[in-house]
Amino acid sequence: MAPWPELGDAQPNPDKYLEGAAGQQPTAPDKSKETNKTDNTEAPVTKIELLPSYSTATLIDEPTEVDDPWNLPTLQDSGIKWSERDTKGKILCFFQGIGRLILLLGFLYFFVCSLDILSSAFQLVGGKMAGQFFSNSSIMSNPLLGLVIGVLVTVLVQSSSTSTSIVVSMVSSSLLTVRAAIPIIMGANIGTSITNTIVALMQVGDRSEFRRAFAGATVHDFFNWLSVLVLLPVEVATHYLEIITQLIVESFHFKNGEDAPDLLKVITKPFTKLIVQLDKKVISQIAMNDEKAKNKSLVKIWCKTFTNKTQINVTVPSTANCTSPSLCWTDGIQNWTMKNVTYKENIAKCQHIFVNFHLPDLAVGTILLILSLLVLCGCLIMIVKILGSVLKGQVATVIKKTINTDFPFPFAWLTGYLAILVGAGMTFIVQSSSVFTSALTPLIGIGVITIERAYPLTLGSNIGTTTTAILAALASPGNALRSSLQIALCHFFFNISGILLWYPIPFTRLPIRMAKGLGNISAKYRWFAVFYLIIFFFLIPLTVFGLSLAGWRVLVGVGVPVVFIIILVLCLRLLQSRCPRVLPKKLQNWNFLPLWMRSLKPWDAVVSKFTGCFQMRCCCCCRVCCRACCLLCDCPKCCRCSKCCEDLEEAQEGQDVPVKAPETFDNITISREAQGEVPASDSKTECTAL
């Protein structure tokens, strides 16, 4: 498939090409009649419907005003100004503001808790499988296998710290070398970026919101993938990460520190431990080939146990079989030796929902997965709603200016680096890059933060998670200190190297451009977002894993042609956009390929057919269910009652009329209602703080 779907002719600026988002075409079609293009690009049939009477403010706008959907929407204040309110109104408004803040914090709390439970759910569903991935002996010799194992395990357990700690315990037990561990750490870095991509999917209801949110989330993915693409071969060739970190570890005489501070966990743990508690040692034990662990449940049953180490006397066939020569004797009849035995006495059961159900891990995991995704989705919707009502007028202006404005010249370049530090600091505070980037995603979606600003924040988040790991490593026991510290430092320097590659020079900020491209595609074909997630985080790693198991020859035999085709397509794409005259006429565009290879439209038809069965069964009562429905099938009719699918008829009939973007309306409520996003009854006077 061509990298830029539906490209008829090569355009000078591929960034400006938008996959069918509202208001994106360079020229507006004839307003009075249907325009049927019959060229080989197969442009969609455009229909115009009569718009409501209030929308006399030109809805069909000049292309210059709306040609970039990446411009942040101006959330205009629809409420009465503060100065125009009476005392009662001001008091009421103040308490409304306080209430909103409490609600926002509450939903944010449950949002973070649901992320934690989502991680637990993934561990219950795929944790044991993840552990078994690690026990593969080929990791040592095949860095590519190590990489995909890192990705798969982190995706399965939804926590890079879990997969990293397994790697650390394996290195300190000499089951794995630091050299073999580095690709796994790189993979874990990729795997951890799936969380905020899942969170972005929850904003599927609004096309423009989804475009921004999905691009904002996937900028993390692309940064990690591109970093690995460059740095893994460099590491395999030079072992620079291993050498640098080894020098650091050997040059310092580290003393065991204190545990990394659990700041956010202190608040969330009291709630999450009432839902489920896991025995994470089981995954590590499976990774270390402990046969007994395979039959153990990950669900923690006993929270208070008493471990009594004792020596028991056991008979042996002869004194040659003694465990220790000094602990061996005979009573004249039998030969005896002493064996150290640990008796574990269960004292008190854990206090969580699943403690007495004795359900299999898969069942508990599935229940928690569904529930946590529903809570996550619900909280996200509410956070977006509350932020949407709060961030208007002056509040929005102040926040946006603070976050997105650069320092004055000549220090403008420093802004991004400050954002990296802020991202690192915030991640250090919340102790999780997933939580930080997931919290960032809805803010990008509603247009508070630009992708350009979210990018350094995300990069900082990557650094922040490694500083946490370094602190955790310093708190490790003596035998694990060196290995855990070296691995944490490898993680740190890998991210630093990635930043040096893809951030300092604006030209190299490829992840932003790639994420925007993916955002455009996903905004038009929302199923493509799920497709992307499955392909990049499951299918590609699993394919590489399978091919690696088959051996180097098979991997190279399949991999080389695939890589060659990808490079060929990229080179051709580059020539088409930069200097098409160099190419023969046939290769100046993708029209020489069958439609299914250069456009997502035929695939969209297939997906629509496949998901057609869901359209009749879509649930309207629940906004959350509706979002899931919209994601799958773009079905308009079923979601009308909850107004969660934008451009209902437009999506159904393939209309590509540039409707005026929300920022050009005088009233945000009108603009949203015009797009079928909020019911008319919602157009009440809004209360804003300023």
Partner: antibody
Amino acid sequence: QVQLVQSGAEVVKPGSSVKISCKTSGFFFTEYIIHWVKQSPGQGLEWIGGIIPNNDVTNYKQNFRGRATLTADKSTNTAYMELRSSLRSEDTAVYYCARWRNAYYSAMDSWGQGTTVTVSS
Amino acid sequence: DIQMTQSPSSLSTSVGDRVTITCTASQDVGTAVAWYQQKPGKSPKLLIYWASTRHTGVPERFSGSGSGTDFTLTISSLQPEDVATYFCQQYRTSPLTFGGGTKVEIK
């Protein structure tokens, strides 16, 4: 208290047999091993063998195998040693029974008073 | 069979003196060594087991040490009631074997 009471002295003719008893009290008979030790006049101690009364498993020193038979009666908490066939003058000795806690390394912590066996014509 | 060689075979010393009896095993027995005291006309009595552990009721003046092949029984301050023959015994492998004994007398 712990007691191992052995049967009285025996004077036997060469070529005959002798059976010595060791009645125990004050402890769980089945939790211990009963050993038999020979002490020739003016000599050191020599281990003959032992029996686990709980399962009647026995072991003997090589030169007593076939000559000594160890048995135990759980109902009366009594251990027996029979020195069979062709008793010789060198079998004249004091024979001790001693207990050893099964599965423990505390050695022979209690001994009987000894039974003197004299082989003479 | 493991041979246990005790030395000296007899010793005569004064009350209050420190007495040291040694026992050498013909091969490594770890710490599976016991010491017994046998007073004239009596049955043996356990003093030390596992090379250095005092049996219940044994006075503190008796102590054992050693591992491998060389073992020592020490009476820190000899008392009149300590006049007896002392035997070492190995219980590392079967058959159980005893030392020849050391006769302790008071001058």
